[in-house]
């Protein structure tokens, strides 16, 4: 087992139990539904959504985060609350990963088809940067990966 698991497991577990990740799930679901409505239900269309990050080659560099955009009525409230919740994980990258994995798992049953799942995952990957937070390294969002066998 990894040393960080032994050191941080309990603290992360209690952080995850305290966190309300529902606003994140609601924000992301609203976002992909908006995108589908805007682009004829084609989740692979390039997004012009106000929350979308720029297409700069370094856009997913977690170390130059951008403050989140508060535009867009319905979802912006969810996004702001979501970002406040994720901010609690800023200093624990492993725990941030687990929070994002939990969001993915919670919504996996509601996602219709592989395309919608991929779209949701793409938006979820962009979420930390939208919140002005660092994206975690070594974090697998695949629901079917079935957890890790730590060494």
């Amino acid at each position: 087992r990894q040393q960080w698991e032994l050191q941080g497991d309990r603290r992360c577990q209690s952080q995850l139990e305290r966190a309300n990740l529902r606003p994140c799930e609601q924000h992301l679901m609203q976002k992909i539904q908006r995108d589908e409505d805007s682009y004829g239900r084609d989740p692979y269309s390039p997004s012009q959504d106000p929350y979308s990050p720029s297409q700069d080659p370094d856009r997913r560099d977690p170390y130059s985060p951008s403050p989140y955009d508060r535009r867009g009525a319905g979802s912006s409230q969810h996004q702001e609350r979501c970002c406040n919740e994720l901010n609690e994980f800023e200093n624990n990258q492993r725990c941030m990963c687990e929070a994002l994995q939990q969001i993915m798992e919670n919504q996996s049953d509601r996602l219709q088809g592989r395309q919608q799942e991929q779209q949701f995952k793409r938006e979820l990957r962009n979420l930390p940067q939208q919140c002005g937070l660092r994206a975690p390294q070594r974090c697998d969002l695949e629901v079917e990966s079935g957890g890790r066998d730590r060494y």
């Epitope: 040393q3 997913r60 390294q137 070594r138 697998d140 066998d149 730590r150 060494y151």
Partner: antibody
Amino acid sequence: QVQLVQSGPEVKKPGASVKVSCQTSGYTFTDYEMNWVRQAPGQGLEWMGLINPHSGDTGYALKFQGRVTMTSDTSKSTVYLELSGLTSEDTAVYYCARSQGTFEVYYFVSWGQGSLVTVSS
Amino acid sequence: SYVLTQPPSVSVAPGKTATITCGANGIGRKRVHWYSQRPGQAPVVVVSDDDDRSSVNPERFSASKSGDTAALTITRVEAGDEADYYCQVWDSRTDQVVFGGGTKVTVL
């Protein structure tokens, strides 16, 4: 630009320990994980483990568990690899390599020049 | 543990195409990165499987993957392409970085 400068060559006796350093510059030290990769003469690359300089968290390859210690000194922007219980099999070039990417994307764009460790009686 | 299998050597004539394979169970679902290494030098990434960073190398280097095989293709091979080539993945199940055994490319 990103620079990783490693300590010089070492000659050690079997059973001894060695400590290799990797001094970084050109980026924010605590923002990226540092990995250690070694290469025995005429052999391939072998990942040893990593350290997160921000948290001090470490993860080691199973093969090296109990023999390897990775540490960092943020005041010097330097990471260290210590390997104990050396045998002739540990004769290799040891590289530090800075991580790149997020989520499941994880690779190494920046490498140190390598530190040769020779274990000989 | 996750094992990446590469052929030990590949020989190719100048101007031709070299293909280096990297085999592993389900590698087509993983992010596969490729490095070249010349004797006495540190490895250099030639192709990274990163959506958000363009490859740092010439268009002659390209990578593909499907099922249990990933491949690095070098088109219009030059003498300067002679080196050892390694594939690399991060295995999420074990949280380990894994390298292939390496392939020595010889330009005839």
